[in-house]
Interface confidence: low
């Protein structure tokens, strides 16, 4: 299936040009999306091109500037947040990135009623997290690992926690491992729907081993960065959840929410918190051995001023074939009765589907079913449930939005997006206003992305929010590669692949092949999305064929494929890449003497193992910031898929699955190893150990480090990285510079 038909005709050929590496590094062909910042059922905020904050009312068609770019510029604000009562705006400046989601910033509060910044009782700096209450204009913020509350922006703060300490106790914000591997947020506090209560997590990292690495900077002596970072099998953070009444915070103070007994009996994690009403909250917990999850619904007891979590409101989710959930355990979406909920988990056939839970999980009513997967529940209203899935036309790498009418019986299902812009749009996400009165659809491809606004009742398109016209025009004279998404059937396994082909691709010719791999558990690389990136350039200008393959362990095709890698990472992911390469060679247009593989992070691990597989298939390959041993990576992630590195659990496979164990096999390939020295996520240690093993085995290899760069290798390092990798591949494939 050709997703991006080439626009090349002989008459046009002279005016058409190939992509250049400069195009990619300059972001010449990047696209825009439009996500409305919803503030009601029919209103949203958006930052205009000239940086004014504009309020749009869909029903009236009116728009007006609530905050001028002049005000934004006066404090160098890069972000903003309107209070729900619309009286104040916080302005965020001095953004300073910490980890993947976390950052610190300076906050100013602007009073819209008088057009002035709030003076007196200003906020301290830098703040780790700040947010408005869902109603009114109360503020909660985290400063120096402690939580503070303001009833109004100009009021003095009320200090909720006092035990916060850098790298020791975290209140209202996650520590490193919870941020990266469990919550995927910079915050760990949650307002109740009307702002009566504030729930927060406390993480105690006192006993966690610390990863230390040098940050070279410009000083005479490097700094040492210390992060409490639990690697596989190490001591984990201790988590507690508290709730405080924000109207009378000093009355009884923070009240701890009890942990379910079956969870508290051994090491455990807190995985998410969902408010149901102001006086009902739902917490999800997970055993350290992550195949048992407990959802606990707790109620506020007015008479005791405490939170009660009856056993009858505990719902257990267990996996017998793998770990609980997909990448994370799914979160519930509660219905209007405030006790029943909708949730995605595996059905009896091993496909993730939406279930309706009224009393017990055993009595759950299955809402969706089939040999495909429900991926996200966006919104439940009184009469509709909106979700995304990859059901349409049986392409796992697509995403369409569906509406199920739950107000009628039997419920009827409608695909909202399947036929909207069928060729252009096959991969959607959505953003809903209050009560799903309106929603925005954001289409990511395979054509040029487009964002549209829709009526939540009729699904009628109201207007185009962003259609990337400039991008479309800019691409008119570019020879883009062709892309196709197809599948291979091998030994009862379906391997979906995306192939990126040079613009004048000719099946009778031979082309060098580059495999791009990620391959991590519950990931998906073969997606019907638009991208003009490095591999587009390699196909367009350098005439390479690039292939991405989703093998065992990848997501959204059922538990059989997903859980195949359980407790044995580094085996089937690699096998499936190799199998696919053999199939590609059989297609007749691949030059089997010029095959390479590259990957980043988990993909660096897989590419390294593939190069060291001893098959002789690969001439060369690149590993960027690879994991080299699962003993070096984070506990929460690693143990989910591998269990514990102990003798009585899975130590043997931990040892067998390292890159270092295969050092000898790199002798007959050209290997480029790349890593940032300040990688907080996959520590430089991983590449240091590969390099050491290769040196000890007297195996030649190439390497590049990026000083003071983290896992993302951003800024000027990005340009250097892709230029360096391009030279390496062109040399490997004997392509002239």
């Amino acid at each position: 299936i050709v997703l991006r038909p080439s626009r090349v005709h002989n008459s046009e050929e002279n005016t058409m040009r190939a992509l250049t590496l400069k195009d990619i590094l300059n972001g010449t062909f990047s696209y825009k999306t439009f996500f409305p910042n919803w503030i009601s059922g029919q209103e949203y905020l958006h930052q205009s091109a000239d940086n004014n904050i504009v309020l749009y009312n869909i029903e009236t068609g009116q728009s007006y500037t609530i905050l001028s770019n002049r005000t934004m510029k006066s404090v160098n604000a890069s972000n903003y947040g309107l209070s729900p009562d619309r009286q104040f705006v916080y302005l965020e400046s001095d953004y300073s990135k910490l980890w993947r989601y976390s950052y610190t910033a300076t906050y100013y509060i602007y009073d819209l009623s008088n057009g002035e910044f709030v003076r007196g009782n200003e906020l301290p700096r830098p703040i780790q997290y700040l947010c408005w209450s869902p109603v009114g204009s109360k503020l909660a913020y985290v400063y120096q690992n402690n939580i503070y509350l303001k009833q109004r922006p100009g009021d003095p703060p009320f200090q909720i926690t006092f035990n916060g300490r850098e790298n020791k106790i975290f209140n209202g914000i996650p520590d490193w491992v919870y941020e990266e591997e469990m919550l995927a947020t910079k915050y760990a506090l949650w307002w109740s729907p009307n702002g009566k209560f504030l729930a927060y997590a406390e993480f105690n990292d006192t006993d966690i081993p610390v990863i230390a690495y040098s940050y070279y900077g410009d000083e005479q002596y490097p700094r040492t960065i210390n992060i409490p970072y639990p690697k596989a099998g190490a001591k984990n953070p201790v988590v507690r959840i508290f709730i405080i009444d924000t109207t009378y915070p000093a009355y009884v103070g923070p009240q701890e929410v009890p942990v379910p007994a079956m969870i508290a009996s051994s090491d455990y994690y807190f995985s998410w918190l969902t408010w149901v009403t102001d006086e009902r909250v739902c917490l999800q917990w997970l055993k350290r051995v992550q195949n048992v999850s407990v959802l606990s619904i707790c109620d506020f007891r007015e008479d005791w001023q405490t939170w009660d979590c009856p056993k009858t409101q505990e719902h257990i989710e267990e996996s017998r074939t793998g770990w609980a959930g997909g990448f994370f355990v799914s979160t519930p979406v509660f219905s209007y009765d405030a006790i029943s909920y909708y949730k995605i988990f595996s059905d009896k056939d091993g496909y993730k589907h939406i279930h309706y839970i009224k009393d017990t999980v055993e009595n759950a009513i299955q809402i969706t079913s089939g040999k495909w997967e429900a991926i996200n529940i966006f919104r439940v209203t009184q009469d509709s449930l909106f979700y995304s899935s990859n059901e349409f036309e049986e392409y796992p790498g697509r995403r369409n939005i569906y509406r199920i009418s739950i107000g009628s019986y039997p419920p009827s299902k409608k695909c909202v997006t399947c036929h909207l812009r069928k060729e252009r749009c096959q991969y959607y996400t959505a953003s809903f206003s209050d009560y799903a009165k309106y929603y925005a659809l954001v289409c990511y491809g395979p054509g040029i992305p487009i964002s549209t606004l829709h009526d939540g009742r009729t699904d009628q398109e109201i207007k185009i929010l962003e259609e990337n016209k400039e991008l479309e025009n800019a691409l008119k004279n570019i020879q883009l590669p062709k892309e196709e998404i197809k599948k291979l059937e091998v030994d009862e396994i379906t391997l979906w692949y995306k192939m990126i082909l040079p613009p004048q691709f000719d099946r009778s010719k031979k082309y060098p092949l580059l495999i791009q791999v990620y391959g991590g558990p519950c990931s998906q690389s073969v997606r019907s999305v638009f991208a003009v990136n490095w591999i587009s350039y390699l196909a367009s200008k350098e005439g390479m064929v690039i292939a991405l393959v989703d093998g065992r362990g990848t997501a959204f095709q059922g538990d059989k494929l997903l859980y195949a890698v359980y407790r044995k990472l580094g085996v089937y992911e690699v096998e499936d890449q190799i199998t696919a390469v053999r199939k590609f060679i059989e297609m007749g247009f691949i030059d089997e003497k010029r095959i390479a593989i590259w990957g980043w992070s988990y993909g660096g691990y897989v590419s390294s193992l593939a190069l060291a597989s001893g098959t002789g298939l690969f001439k060369c390959g690149i590993a960027v910031a690879p994991v080299s041993s699962w003993e070096y990576y984070a506990s929460v992630y690693t143990e989910r898929f591998m269990g514990l590195p102990t003798k009585d659990d899975n130590l043997e496979h931990y040892k067998n699955s390292t890159v270092m164990a295969r050092a000898e096999y790199f002798r007959n390939v050209d290997y480029l190893l790349i890593h940032g020295t300040a990688d907080d996520n996959v520590h430089f240690q991983n590449s240091a150990q590969i390099a050491k093993a290769l040196v000890n085995a007297q195996v030649d290899f190439q390497a590049m480090w990026y000083s003071d760069q983290n896992h993302g290798l951003s800024g000027l390092s990005t340009n250097h990285l892709y230029t360096h990798m391009t030279h390496f591949l062109k040399q490997c494939f004997s392509l002239s510079d």
């Epitope: 009312n57 869909i58 029903e59 009236t60 068609g61 009116q62 007006y64 729900p84 009562d85 619309r86 009286q87 109603v135 009114g136 109201i462 207007k463």
Partner: antibody, heavy 120, light 111 residues
Framework: QVQLVQSGAEVKKPGASVKVSCKAS????????IHWVRQAPGQGLEWMGW????????KYAQKLQGRVTMTTDTSTSTAYMELRSLRSDDTAVYYC?????????????WGQGTLVTVSS | EIVLTQSPGTLSLSPGERATLSCRAS??????????MHWYQQKPGQAPRLLIY???NLESGIPDRFSGSGSGTDFTLTISRLEPEDFAVYYC?????????FGQGTKLEIK
């Protein structure tokens, strides 16, 4: 300055239709909603509906749904209100009004009104 | 729909006096941010004229003897010192919900 100028008075027979125009000037026509409000002789004001010339968004009062059509011509900055199947109780002064620049539903500028008389 | 009830129906006062006109809504027309109530003046043979928007904001060009107050369901238009040109019919209007509705009017006449 902002002005809304309406078409002249009309006399119609029951069952007929009437189309009243409202020409806007002094502001960007596509930015503000135009409301239509009527007032029967000696009576109060009754909101009939709105049209937003920029987005084409239209809202009609339930009572008039099916009989009223509101349109705009952005090239001439003119709004139109057509009322069909006229009855004697449709006799009224018909006003167009601009949705205020502050938004939120106040009508800051009004046309001079068009008297529509329905009589056999 | 939201019904607006104005009182009194007719108010007889002399120039120089203070006028207080009332408007009660059948349900709240306020949110935490705004009260969606507006006031208009209409003289015989003329179109209505906006005086007050969002309960208490004076429209530009309107004399400051006019003021508005209230929230929720009860609203007041006050004219601090009546001038001869103030004698007219006054209407309140809500825009909290569709359909927009007007009160039946209060006639302010010279005593």
């Amino acid at each position: 300055q902002v002005q809304l100028v309406q078409s002249g008075a009309e006399v119609k027979k029951p069952g007929a239709s009437v189309k009243v125009s409202c020409k806007a000037s002094g502001y960007t026509f596509t930015e503000n909603i135009i409301h239509w409000v009527r007032q029967a002789p000696g009576q109060g004001l009754e909101w009939m509906g709105w049209i937003h010339p920029g987005s084409g968004s239209i809202k009609y009062a339930q009572k008039l749904q099916g009989r009223v059509t509101m349109t705009t011509d952005t090239s001439t900055s003119t709004a139109y209100m057509e009322l069909r199947s006229l009855r004697s109780d449709d006799t009224a002064v018909y006003y167009c009004a601009r949705h205020g620049a502050t938004g939120r539903g106040a009508m800051d500028y009004w046309g001079q009104g068009t008297l529509v008389t329905v009589s056999s | 729909e939201i019904v607006l009830t104005q009182s009194p129906g007719t108010l007889s006062l002399s120039p120089g006096e203070r006028a207080t006109l009332s408007c009660r809504a059948s349900q709240s027309v306020s949110t935490s941010a705004y009260s969606y109530m507006h006031w208009y003046q209409q003289k015989p043979g003329q179109a209505p004229r906006l005086l007050i928007y969002l309960a208490s904001n004076l429209e530009s060009g309107i004399p400051d003897r006019f003021s508005g107050s209230g929230s929720g369901t009860d609203f007041t238009l006050t004219i601090s010192r009546l001038e001869p040109e103030d004698f007219a019919v006054y209407y309140c209007q809500q825009s909290r919900e569709l359909p927009y509705t007007f009160g039946q009017g209060t006639k302010l006449e010279i005593k």
